[in-house]
Amino acid sequence: AFGISGVPKYTRALHDSSITGISPITESLASLSTYNDQSITFALEDESYEIYVEDLKKDKKKDKVLLSYYESQHPSSESGDGVDGKMLMVTLSPTKDFWLQANNKEHSVELHKCEKPLPDQAFFVLHNRSFNCVSFECKTDPGVFIGVKDNHLALIKVDYSENLGSENILFKLSE
């Protein structure tokens, strides 16, 4: 997934999904970019991963993220988001054994190495938005979404009545 040495890349074969309890219903590899077409990239720095939001040079390959889709038992309030009234949740893994996680105390999005079953902080409710975009709502903190702040990913509290279409929480998935 990463264009830097020492970081395992995803091949076409996806993760082994034999986890205890909850299991994904589908998986796919995709690159993640913002509403304004900036790329979400990942870099290994001082033995920890940093997440950046940046304009990519033309010849640079986009980082890929493994999206694992899960069915949530919570009812879907949005037409087209769910199936049979279920919401979809996703986990996002840019490299093997590392997942994006919500740090609600710090209002940050971090990459952590963790074992399965994954913690609730690694799950995000998937919302289909206009302009072929999606948004990611924290399972652990409804109303809080992954968003872009100062060229980094952050957790952003959204007022449902006002800003659900706010550009800084909209993302595009592309193969």
């Epitope: 074969a13 082994d16 999904s17 299991s23 219903i25 998986e27 796919s28 199936v83 289909n128």
Partner: antibody
Framework: EVQLVETGGGLIQPGGSLRLSCAAS????????MSWVRQAPGKGLEWVSA????????YYADSVKGRFTISRDNSKNTLYLQMNSLRAEDTAVYYC????????????????WGQGTLVTVSS | EIVLTQSPGTLSLSPGERATLSCRAS??????LSWYQQKPGQAPRLLIY???HRATGIPDRFSGSGSGTDFTLTISRLEPEDFAVYYC??????????FGGGTKVEIK
């Protein structure tokens, strides 16, 4: 009621063209990837083509690549399959199918199927 | 292209018996595999998705298992309405997506 209705099938000569349509109702069409699947008489299922919810990504089986074109009009809730340079081996019932989950991508199972439309390629 | 091989081609069983259908992929498809039932003159019907998740309204006698390259559909006790053709289908990352050749479950 969630429904898919295919139209446009019929008898066509080898080398001819045909356009199939699939009218969708009862769901948010643009949220779902769609596929065409065919079944030759007495044979098994063959995936033909798929398109993402936005229409930005399209996929084809090797057997139809360069001859068939999948498209969609989200404002009309309609899926299309333009079939050119038709061959006898394209004779089949053509089904349109909707993915199970509204994730816009094509990587999903098919939950809703139309009743199918028969395409016969023969001179 | 990922090839799905279903076995056996035909399964002759009696109502009440257990049916075990196999689907093997030529390379890993993760859990991106589904199972369908088709009866003559009808469109296919989704039974199992994500290798092991039962679709809404499907009786619990149907179950799916496996990941990677080896998958199984099990019908714990065959009912008269279960006699049909069953197909597996992979929708992994690289199209073309493919179906298996089918397994016909017939009355013995």
């Amino acid at each position: 009621e969630v429904q898919l209705v295919e139209t446009g099938g019929g008898l066509i000569q080898p080398g001819g063209s045909l356009r199939l349509s699939c009218a969708a109702s009862g769901f948010t069409f643009s949220s779902y990837a769609m596929s065409w699947v065919r079944q030759a008489p007495g044979k098994g299922l063959e995936w033909v083509s798929a398109i993402s919810g936005s229409g930005g990504s399209t996929y084809y089986a090797d057997s139809v690549k360069g001859r068939f074109t999948i498209s969609r009009d989200n404002s009309k809730n309609t899926l299309y399959l333009q079939m050119n340079s038709l061959r006898a081996e394209d004779t089949a019932v053509y089904y349109c199918a909707r993915t199970l989950h509204g994730i816009r991508a094509a990587y999903d199972a098919f939950i809703i199927w139309g009743q199918g439309t028969l395409v016969t390629v023969s001179s | 292209e990922i090839v799905l091989t279903q076995s056996p081609g035909t399964l002759s069983l009696s109502p009440g018996e257990r049916a075990t259908l196999s689907c093997r992929a030529s390379q890993s498809v993760g859990i991106n595999l589904s199972w369908y039932q088709q009866k003559p003159g009808q469109a296919p019907r989704l039974l199992i998705y994500g290798a092991s998740h039962r679709a809404t309204g499907i009786p619990d006698r149907f179950s799916g298992s496996g990941s990677g390259t080896d998958f199984t559909l099990t019908i714990s006790r065959l009912e008269p309405e279960d006699f049909a053709v069953y197909y597996c289908h992979q929708y992994s990352q690289s199209p073309p997506f493919t179906f298996g050749g089918g397994t016909k479950v017939e009355i013995k």
